[in-house]
Every structure is written in structure tokens, then in C-alpha cells.
Interface confidence: medium
């Protein structure tokens, strides 16, 4: 999960496995101020999950969600 | 290159229990989702079991619930399927079959299959 | 719970198109996936999330999902080709997988 240092989200690990993709309802990306780039996946267990927007999966899925 | 290097042949009684491991090598199973699906013969794929990422809880499909198990040993890289209470139904070809992430969350990588025959 | 709907068999002479298809409700929105499986062996990812091949698979196959059913595409069917097919699906509302009934297809 993100840790939020006063309203700016930050994730310093990612997810090491692929969620899978109907888990997902929603993603954002964390600001630029935190130290690891990082998408926020909010899940359908309104979860946020943090994972590493260079793996393709992740890349995949916010294509996915863009377009629904 | 990255395999899943599952168990060899099972011959089990009505009513005992079988153990079916599956390997992962050249990756890391924690980067890894493991499902296991099995194939009775002459019959289609039926999926049976997965653990959630989000959580590490394992998901059972209706069927397998209460009498299925699956578990993971992250420090040999190893999967594990066991079933109980077995009956000639059971007999089959269990996959493991993984997500790597590389085609969103399609399995994958498959392993040879182990198959498990239940008979008196 | 979720059910994919496929034809038991389909038949095609070589050089000709095969189309597999997977009847489900309300496919649309959900990423189709097929497998092909040989005659003793594993099955095999062939196209993933209804329309992108797998590495590896050549380009004959295509995939395509219209919204209550998907369809594999085989172009220039090769006697090779001749396997059981599966679609699957994610079926959000039991959280499982859940595969077609298979569709044989055979090279005349």
C-alpha cells in the first residue's frame, strides 16, 4: 500500500506478482515528488496496491482502463 | 528459460490424499501467480485453485473448497496442490500453470501435468 | 456460475480459415483468452485479452471479441493446427476462471 506523507501518496515497494486485470477498479499515479515512480491500483476490494509502472502488465492494464 | 517442473505420476486409493508439487525455475515464484487446473480424461480444462495476490489468500473454486489445499514454499520456489477424499472423479491430469505478467493475467507458462489416478 | 459456450468440433481443409468461437453473457469489457493443446500435451497460450498473440504463436492466428461472443481465427490452417482449442475468462462476480467446453478442430 502507498504510505502518505502529509496528502502525497508514495509507494517504496511494488507488487511482485500480476493482479489480475478484473481486480482493478481504478488507478492513479503518485506524484512526482516521491522518491519511486509508481501506479496506485485501487482494487475491488478497495485496496491500493502499488506497482512498478514499467512492467508490462501494468502498462496493459492502464491502457485497458483507459479505454473502458 | 522459465519452467514449471511439476511432480511425477500419483496411483492413489478412494479416499486417501495426493500432494502434486510444482517447481518454478529461472524466476522467482513470488514474481510469479500459480494456478492449478486439472483435466479429467477426455475431458476439458477445469481451473480449480490460485492465490490472490492482493492478499496471499488461496481462492478455491466451489467444487475443490474444503477438500482442496494450496500452498507455496517461497524458499525452494515450489507450489503445492493437495487434494483429499479422494474418488475415481478426481482421476486426472493436474497443471500448474502461472502468470508472469508478460500477457496481462493469461496463463502463461504451463507445466507437463501430473496425473493422478484414484482406483481400488 | 459463469459459462463459455463453445462447439464441440470444428472441421477445415488445409489453406482454409478456421473460426473457433465462445459464446458468453456480456463478454464485452472482459479480456477473452485462448489456448490451444495438442494431442498429449500442455496447453499453450495462444492469443491473450481477446486479440494479442502470444510470442511465438505466427501470425495466422488472430482473435477477436464482439461482445457476446469471441472468436479465434486460424488463416492458412496447417494440419499442425489440429488441437483442442479453450477460451477463458475471468468471471468477476464468483472470482474464479472459467474455461469454455473445448472445440476440436481437425485438419481434413
Known amino acids: 500500500s502507498p504510505y502518505s506523507s502529509d496528502t502525497t501518496p508514495c509507494c517504496f515497494a511494488y507488487i511482485a506478482r500480476p493482479l489480475p486485470r478484473a481486480h482493478i477498479k481504478e488507478y492513479f499515479y503518485t506524484s512526482g515528488k516521491c522518491s519511486n515512480p509508481a501506479v496506485v491500483f485501487v482494487t475491488r476490494k478497495n485496496r491500493q496496491v502499488c506497482a512498478n509502472p514499467e512492467k508490462k502488465w501494468v502498462r496493459e492494464y492502464i491502457n485497458s482502463l483507459e479505454m473502458s | 528459460q522459465v519452467q514449471l517442473v511439476q511432480s511425477g505420476a500419483e496411483v492413489k486409493k478412494p479416499g486417501a490424499s495426493v500432494k502434486v508439487s510444482c517447481k518454478v525455475s529461472g524466476y522467482a515464484l513470488s514474481e510469479l501467480s500459480i494456478h492449478w487446473v486439472r483435466q479429467a480424461p477426455g475431458k476439458g480444462l477445469e481451473w480449480m485453485s490460485y492465490i490472490d495476490p492482493e492478499d496471499g489468500e488461496p481462492i478455491y473454486a466451489q467444487k475443490f473448497q474444503g477438500r482442496a489445499t494450496m500452498t507455496e514454499d517461497s524458499s525452494t520456489d515450489t507450489a503445492y496442490m493437495e487434494m483429499g477424499s479422494l474418488t475415481s472423479d478426481d482421476t486426472a491430469v493436474y497443471y500448474c500453470?502461472?502468470?508472469?505478467?508478460?500477457?496481462?493475467?493469461?496463463?502463461?507458462?504451463w507445466g507437463r501435468g501430473t496425473l493422478v489416478t484414484v482406483s481400488s | 456460475s459463469y459459462v463459455l459456450t463453445q462447439d464441440p468440433s470444428v472441421s477445415v481443409a488445409p489453406g482454409q480459415t478456421a473460426r473457433i468461437t465462445c459464446g458468453g453473457a456480456n463478454l464485452w469489457g472482459l479480456g477473452v483468452h485462448w489456448y490451444q493443446q495438442k494431442s498429449g500435451q500442455a496447453p499453450v497460450l495462444v492469443v491473450s485479452d481477446n486479440s494479442d498473440r502470444a510470442s511465438g504463436i505466427p501470425e495466422r492466428f488472430s482473435g477477436s471479441n464482439s461482445g457476446t461472443t469471441a472468436t479465434l481465427t486460424l488463416s492458412r490452417v496447417e494440419v499442425g493446427d489440429e488441437a483442442d482449442y479453450y477460451c477463458?475468462?475471468?468471471?468477476?462476480?464468483?472470482?474464479?476462471?472459467v474455461f469454455g467446453g473445448r472445440t476440436k478442430l481437425t485438419v481434413l
Open positions: 500453470a502461472g502468470v508472469t505478467g508478460s500477457t496481462s493475467d493469461a496463463f502463461d507458462l
Open positions: 477463458q475468462v475471468w468471471d468477476s462476480s464468483s472470482d474464479h476462471w
